[in-house]
């Protein structure tokens, strides 16, 4: 396993609809044709997998149908969007990139993006 640099923004604020987007960029050390991207969430010293996708260079990034993540790839950067977020989902979201093929295998883990999610205030009852 060889190490690889990964960069991502330090902080992102989710929209009022619970959607957060950020870029994950990696320093590809060679001609990788198969790349796996995983988003991990770290909160209270626990790390859980949020979503993952494997893609072939030049093809679309495909997450599972029930995934809360969507994304697009362009060269050695991936644009990730996480949907359905609520205040309790606030945490550090870490981008993990693996160059699966051809060998050698490379692994890169970003420093994480702190995503803040604020639940919208319910609208007050109106007389109208």
């Amino acid at each position: 396993c060889k190490a690889m640099h990964v960069a991502q923004p330090a902080v992102v604020l989710a929209s009022s609809r619970g959607i957060a987007s950020f870029v994950c960029e990696y320093a590809s050390p060679g001609k990788a044709t198969e790349v796996r991207v995983t988003v991990l969430r770290q909160a209270d010293s626990q790390v859980t997998e949020v979503c993952a996708a494997t893609y072939m260079m030049g093809n679309e990034l495909t997450f599972l149908d029930d995934s809360i993540c969507t994304g697009t790839s362009s060269g050695n950067q991936v644009n990730l969007t996480i949907q359905g977020l609520r205040a309790m989902d606030t945490g550090l979201y870490i981008c993990k990139v693996e160059l699966m093929y051809p060998p050698p295998y490379y692994l890169g883990i970003g420093n994480g993006t702190q995503i803040y999610v604020i639940d919208p205030e319910p609208c007050p009852d109106s007389d109208f």
Epitope: H5, E25, Y26, A27, K31, G75, N76, Q77
Partner: nanobody
């Protein structure tokens, strides 16, 4: 859209040095990571070096590490490749390529670059 033009190639004796330039027009190069590649007749394109947008991140394959150095001058919209201790096997057409990125990293994979120069010939011979 950014356009790239390489220069600085030519004939050099074994053991000599050359500095190649990659000049950009049509856009500011500071928005782009830049890579240098080469292709010899009948061979695959080979990665040589890359540099991130700010110049703080560079990467080289083992084959040229220590002999080749990549630098950039964003004020001049130019990236340079300094090549020392040249050998006959360094004879090839040298290309620079650019990729618009958000952060400071760069890639050594030709697959990641979408804008290429037309190349400059380097011949190492006595």
């Amino acid at each position: 859209e950014v356009q790239l033009v390489e220069s600085g190639g030519g004939l050099v004796q074994p053991g000599g040095s050359l500095r190649l330039s990659c000049a950009a027009s049509g856009d500011t190069l500071e928005s782009f990571a830049v890579g240098w590649f080469r292709q010899a007749p009948g061979k695959e394109r080979e990665e040589l070096a890359c540099i991130g947008r700010t110049g703080e991140f560079t990467d080289y394959p083992g084959s040229v590490k220590g002999r080749f150095t990549i630098t950039r001058d964003n004020a001049k919209n130019t990236v340079y490749l300094q090549m020392n201790s040249l050998r006959a096997e360094d004879t090839a057409v040298y290309y620079c390529a650019a990729e618009r990125l958000v952060f400071h990293l760069c890639s050594l994979s030709e697959y990641d670059y979408d804008t290429w120069g037309q190349g400059t010939q380097v011949t190492v011979s006595s």
